[in-house]
């Protein structure tokens, strides 16, 4: 649960402010499977990439979800982009990053991972991302991600980009960034686990 | 169905160039991309690149920047690959292959043979 | 660039036979990966995506299996009409890398 929502936010972060306008422009006309309504306008519009996209999943659900997210990025002409977003969520278990063993389906862990409830936080508030990356790498980041978020000017770009590689990760993964935060920013994990 | 249907095969002297054709049917054109890949005598498949249909945008793989160049009649939902200054070593079978669920190529032209000799 | 390799680059097997076809990519591509089956002097044709997905259509002797960069397609008791050769393939992104190739001959 929770890898069709990261795919879905990772590809609408990824458009260009007037892409995600459009892509809110074509939500409110794309046909809807019956028994589906549609996300108010007035809501939809003053989303941002984080809120439209729990309001997609809350709305359609992850699988549905997807699907109509896809359909909306082909009908904007983003082709590969949707492709890959039929991809990511159409990945079985057996996806888990470099060694790490992905639990049984009965384990399944309800709701959101504490990563994925406080992506927007994390992103904005993470200041030692050399130390989780060194923490992650070998065991959930390969060489050439482990160097393309180090790569990143900033921060929170550097969080972004990490952040990119989420989909594909199973909760053993999160686990395991979430332990690397525990360890080197404590305060911000207590602070998020309290609101 | 989905169909792809390519042009017939074509033989050229080093120099000239090529236009192959890959008209599609049975799907709205626009919403999938149209792949290019390469299959010389006795050789695997090689990737060219693809053009993006609703943008008209193309892109190259390495090997195939310069002398090549991918384009589209939307109206026809046809897409097009040219050679300029044909080689020996541009004889192959060409196939159009449609970018299509999950970025697989999910729908094939029957391939089109181009032999380039003096 | 990811580089995909597949082993054996051929293979002989015999009607009623069980092969497998491995593939290996240069770096974890997860489980995105296809299946392609190319018979003499036709076009390929979409077996498996997203490394175990068997495509509607495809008989199901075929199963793709694996992730991160070790993959396989096993065919179960083997048909006539499963002899040509097959290519694994990335298929998330660019550069939507082939492998070598593997030719599957009749014995």
């Known amino acids: 649960m929770g890898r069709a929502r990261d795919a879905i936010l990772d590809a609408l972060e990824n458009l260009t402010a007037e892409e995600l306008k459009k892509f809110k422009l074509k939500l409110l006309s794309v046909p809807l499977r019956e028994g589906y309504g549609r996300i108010p306008r007035g809501a939809l519009l003053s989303m941002d990439a984080l809120d439209l996209t729990d309001k997609l999943v809350s709305f359609y659900l992850e699988t549905y979800g997807a699907e109509l997210t896809a359909n909306v990025l082909r009908d904007m002409g983003l082709q590969e982009m949707a492709g890959q977003l039929q991809a990511a969520t159409h990945q079985g278990s057996g996806a888990a990053p470099a060694g790490i063993q992905a639990p049984p389906q009965s384990a399944a862990k309800p709701g959101l991972h504490f990563i994925d409830q406080h992506r927007a936080a994390l992103i904005a508030r993470v200041t030692n991302v050399e130390w989780l990356l060194d923490a992650l790498y070998g065991k959930v980041l390969t060489d050439e991600q482990y160097q393309a978020v180090r790569a990143e000017p900033t921060n929170p770009s550097k969080m972004r980009k990490l952040f990119s590689f989420t989909p594909a990760w199973n909760w053993t993964c999160k686990d395991l960034l979430l332990q690397a935060l525990r360890e080197s920013q404590s305060y911000l994990v207590e602070d998020l686990e309290r609101s | 169905q989905i169909q792809l249907v390519q042009s017939g095969p074509e033989l050229k002297k080093p120099g000239e160039t090529v236009k192959i054709s890959c008209k599609a049917s049975g799907y709205t054109f626009t919403k999938y991309g149209m792949n290019w890949v390469k299959q010389a005598p006795g050789k695997g498949l090689k990737r060219m690149g693809w053009i993006n249909t609703y943008t008209g945008e193309p892109t190259y793989s390495d090997d195939f920047k310069g002398r090549f160049a991918f384009s589209l009649e939307t109206s026809a939902s046809t897409a097009y690959l040219q050679i300029n200054n044909l080689k020996n070593d541009d004889t192959a079978t060409y196939f159009c292959?449609?970018?299509?669920?999950?970025?697989?190529?999910?729908?094939w032209g029957q391939g089109t043979t181009l032999t380039v000799s003096s | 660039d990811i580089q995909m390799t597949q082993s054996p680059a051929s293979l002989s097997a015999t009607v009623g036979e069980t092969v497998t076809i491995t593939c290996r990519a240069s770096?974890?591509?997860?489980?995105?990966l296809a299946w392609y089956q190319q018979k003499q002097g036709k076009s390929p044709q979409l077996l498996v995506h997203?490394?175990?997905t068997l495509v509607e259509g495809v008989p199901s002797r075929f199963s793709g299996s694996g992730s991160g960069t070790q993959f396989s397609l096993k065919i179960n008791s083997l048909e006539p009409e499963d002899f040509g050769n097959y290519y694994c393939q990335y298929h998330y992104g660019s550069p939507y890398t082939f492998g070598g190739g593997t030719k599957l001959e009749i014995k």
């Open positions: 292959a449609r970018l299509g669920y999950a970025n697989s190529f999910d729908s």
């Open positions: 997203n490394a175990n």
């Open positions: 770096e974890n591509i997860y489980t995105y």
